[in-house]
Amino acid sequence: HTAAQDNCTCPTNKMTVCSPDGPGGRCQCRALGSGMAVDCSTLTSKCLLLKARMSAPKNARTLVRPSEHALVDNDGLYDPDCDPEGRFKARQCNQTSVCWCVNSVGVRRTDKGDLSLRCDELVRTHHILIDLRHRPTAGAFNHSDLDAELRRLFRERYRLHPKFVAAVHYEQPTIQIELRQNTSQKAAGDVDIGDAAYYFERDIKGESLFQGRGGLDLRVRGEPLQVERTLIYYLDEIPPKFSMKRLTA
């Protein structure tokens, strides 16, 4: 696993401990909480980061209305079970034997049950809608400048391939970033949209996961873009399965 060899640190994940005892005597960085070695040349999976922390059509200018099947992460933080590759296990349980199924970004997609609950597969989140509200500014941002800056951010800071940023919508003060990545589109080495969205979310909150970098300084044509609210919606390849009781609540 690559890391900054000279001083053995992990540029993409500060929630690690690094030492020169990896294969071939190379620097190896282990995620806090799980102890799994991480690849410091790319983003760390959201599952390992969570564990460490506890331990619309492309050119449309209108805002997207999240579908009825869109999930919002209302459950907050939990200590997840990750598979040997660092992905979320389909079934998550807490210490009181309450279990539930999650999607590939770790968001609950079923009612909670007991240890008999079955989650046959990890359902992929293929569409993420990041809904931002920016602080008041003298005037609206130029949409194409804003679009370009956010695409640059995801490409350069989060190493997300540009084809996965499906659209950037803007109706002052609301900005929406759409990320799309089907199972068939994601090649080996591609950053997962769920991981990119999580890094972005933490950056926006002023909790950057990057080692030694300053916080996120978003500017559009020199004008600071300051976010005051963030909502993230997750759409899965297979719709979630909640009881009617929850849907009407």
């Epitope: 053995c8 401990v17 030492s19 020169p20 005892d21 990896g22 294969p23 071939g24 190896q28 806090l32 799980s34 102890g35 799994m36 070695a37 040997p84 590759e85």
Partner: antibody
């Protein structure tokens, strides 16, 4: 050359505590994990936990989380493990070892728990 | 936690013969497996790291192979001093664990 030198044998009564030290030399103490492993008489090897000396980040085997405490003093390149509320089945040889693949080991410290 | 299962528990061979020791992991651990030799009254000694990387000072008759869940330690031609207990250990994630050991004895 790399060396890990452990403190001497200990005899303790049930319920007491024991603290074993491991003095490192011949390498940069702060940049390598120190692991603690024990071996009961006639048994296999059991991982107790590990500590990263530079920031004292410690990880424990669940089995020992309530009773073991690992610390490190970087000023004298020494790691410690303290085991409390000793029981007779804690009788074992306790080893410290370096790095994720345990390339260097201490000579072992025999801890006997007997009333 | 990851469980390492070593086989056989005991292996009886003669000097000069080839020894093949197995270690199976309960889940994919890549190449994060290490092999140790332990003689009575002594500390374990590292023989192979990361499944197949050789260790300075260890005779070339010791070699390792495998990845994922199945790993092998091979001693190409046994010397009298090789009769000991052998352990595998993983460093994939916490907690690290050891196999239960394989005792290599003289036939």
């Amino acid at each position: 050359q790399v060396q890990l030198v452990q403190s001497g044998a200990e005899v303790k009564k049930p319920g007491a505590s024991v603290k074993v030290s491991c003095k490192a030399s011949g390498y940069s103490f702060t940049t390598h994990w120190i692991h603690w492993v024990r071996q009961a008489p006639g048994q296999g090897l059991e991982w107790i936990g590990t500590i990263f000396p530079s920031n004292a980040y410690a990880v424990y085997n669940q089995k020992f989380r309530d009773r073991a405490t690992m610390t490190a003093d970087t000023s004298i390149s020494t790691a410690y493990i303290e085991l409390s509320r000793l029981r007779s089945d804690d009788t074992a040889v306790y080893y410290c070892a370096r790095a994720s693949y345990f390339d260097y080991w201490g000579q072992g410290t025999t801890v006997t728990v007997s009333s | 936690e990851i469980v390492l299962t070593q086989s056989p528990a005991t292996l009886s061979l003669s000097p000069g013969e080839r020894a093949t020791l197995s270690c199976r992991a309960s889940q994919n651990i890549g190449t994060s497996i290490h092999w140790f030799q332990q003689k009575p009254g002594g500390a374990p000694r590292l023989l192979i790291k990361y499944a197949s990387e050789s260790i300075s000072g260890i005779p070339s008759r010791f070699s390792g192979s495998g990845s994922g869940t199945d790993f092998t330690l091979t001693i190409s031609s046994l010397e009298p001093e090789d009769f000991a207990v052998y352990y595998c250990q993983h460093s994939h994630s916490w907690p690290f664990t050891f196999g239960q050991g394989t005792k290599l004895e003289i036939k």
